[in-house]
């Protein structure tokens, strides 16, 4: 995502189609308060950021309210009046959906249905990963609504679950970010557990997009 302009690297994250975060890393200007100027319409004047992110006392990014703006962000990072990086980008390329909310588990013998609140926009995948202490890696199942049924579980085993949301690659492109994971929830015999006690250190989840 970054650019080569004067050695400025940028990162854009569009949180849940609500807030855009643009951060920069400019070694040449590491002790400088660069300013961030932006607009959502190519015909408007630039506004200056009012919500800077700071790193070691210097500006390193900007948070923008961009709710219901699914198109273009025009921006300029400046050292005084001198632009050091200028770009215009489709924001949805950098979508990061919000983490699943109101995650619920409904058990029926050897199957569980995991549900959560669907986000207000579409073309998303809701992924549930789960494992028992006897599994060497996480198993995964995903659906395009937050209603995921996993069958063939062993009622006697303790299972850990967590859920996340991903933007469909065919729609949003391959450079989006998956949501943060929901909290891990542990279940055994249809009842919630504090932990799966006999679980060894869990392996890292598959980072499939």
């Amino acid at each position: 995502q970054g650019g080569a302009a004067e050695g400025v690297q940028i990162q854009i994250i569009y949180f849940n189609l609500e807030t855009v975060q643009v951060t920069w890393n400019a070694s040449k200007y590491s002790r400088t308060n660069l300013t961030f100027h932006y607009r959502f319409n190519g015909d408007e004047a630039y506004d200056q950021c009012t919500n800077y992110l700071l790193q070691e006392g210097h500006t390193s990014g900007c948070l923008l309210d961009a709710e219901q703006r699914d198109d273009i962000l025009y921006f300029s990072i400046r050292n005084g009046t001198h632009p050091v990086f200028t770009a215009s980008r489709w924001m949805v390329y950098y979508l990061k959906p919000s983490s699943p909310k109101h995650v619920r588990f409904s058990w029926h013998q050897d199957a569980v249905t995991v549900t959560c609140s669907d986000l207000s926009y579409g073309d998303l995948l809701y992924e549930v990963q789960y494992r028992s202490p006897f599994d060497t890696e996480w198993q995964s199942k995903q659906e395009n609504t937050c209603n995921v049924t996993i069958e063939g579980l062993d009622a006697e085993k303790c299972y850990s679950f967590w859920v996340r949301v991903k933007a469909m690659e065919d729609v949003y492109g391959p450079d989006t970010y998956p949501s943060d994971w929901s909290e891990v929830t542990c279940w055994q015999r249809g009842e919630i557990r504090d932990a799966c006690a006999e679980t060894p250190t869990p392996p890292k989840p598959k980072l499939s997009k």
Epitope: Q9, I10, A87, W90, G173
Partner: antibody, heavy 122, light 107 residues
């Protein structure tokens, strides 16, 4: 399978206007998730994106051309249009209409018409 | 706007050769880079999307790679019908832009 056929090209005098049409068949231009674009190719073979119109009628234009072009559509005729004003010699090009990949205005162009040649000359 | 620079501008190759065309972007664009083939007197045809994703109906000898600012289109075992001009295009930057093209001639 979508088919796109452009028409309306020809010889135009400098300062004049043109209106190009693009008739789509085999696919509705109002299908959700698709954007339609005009792209031109200069005699030297360089390609320039001109603008989009979406399934929702939203338009985006190349800033370099924004003051001179308008993209519109007629749903009943399943057709797109490009209106271009104040033409100059450097607007001489083959004009293509094309469809974006599903997902909208952000992507590559997977279906193209055969193009229509516009020559601007006195 | 994001400038895409292709190299070489022109290449003359013999059938069955392996051909590599590069495209460099003036700003990083992740993997949102697409490749087109245009044969004489035809319109461009999408070959590869998102740097390396294949397109249905395109021969498997065409492949793409790269991310960030540097991208490559590779044609393995070139065939006579591959004589064409090849263009790269970026999509996250506005406006979308194309490379200047690489003309491939078959000896």
């Amino acid at each position: 399978q979508v088919q796109l056929v452009e028409s309306g090209g020809g010889l135009v005098k400098p300062g004049g206007s043109l209106r190009l049409s693009c008739a789509a068949s085999g696919f509705s231009i109002t299908t959700s998730g698709y954007y339609w674009t005009w792209i031109r190719q200069f005699p030297g073979k360089g390609l320039e994106w001109m603008g989009y119109i979406g399934y929702n009628s939203k338009t985006y234009y190349n800033p370099a051309l924004k003051s001179r072009i308008t993209i519109s559509r007629d749903n009943a005729k399943n057709s797109l249009y490009l209106q271009m004003n104040s033409l100059r010699a450097e607007d001489t090009a083959v004009y293509y209409c094309a469809r974006s990949l599903y997902g909208g205005y952000k992507d590559a162009f997977d279906s193209w018409g055969q193009g229509t040649l516009v020559t601007v000359s006195s | 706007e994001i400038v895409l620079t292709q190299s070489p501008d022109f290449q003359s190759v013999t059938p069955k050769e392996k051909v590599t065309i590069t495209c460099r972007a003036s700003q990083s664009i992740g993997t949102s880079l697409h490749w087109y083939q245009q044969k004489p007197d035809q319109s461009p045809k999408l070959l590869i999307k998102f740097a390396s994703r294949s397109i249905s109906g395109v021969p498997s000898r065409f492949s793409g790679s790269g991310s960030g600012t540097d991208f490559t289109l590779t044609i393995n075992s070139l065939e006579a019908e591959d004589a064409a001009t090849y263009y790269c295009q970026q999509s996250p930057g506005f406006p979308p832009t194309f490379g200047q093209g690489t003309k491939l001639e078959i000896k």
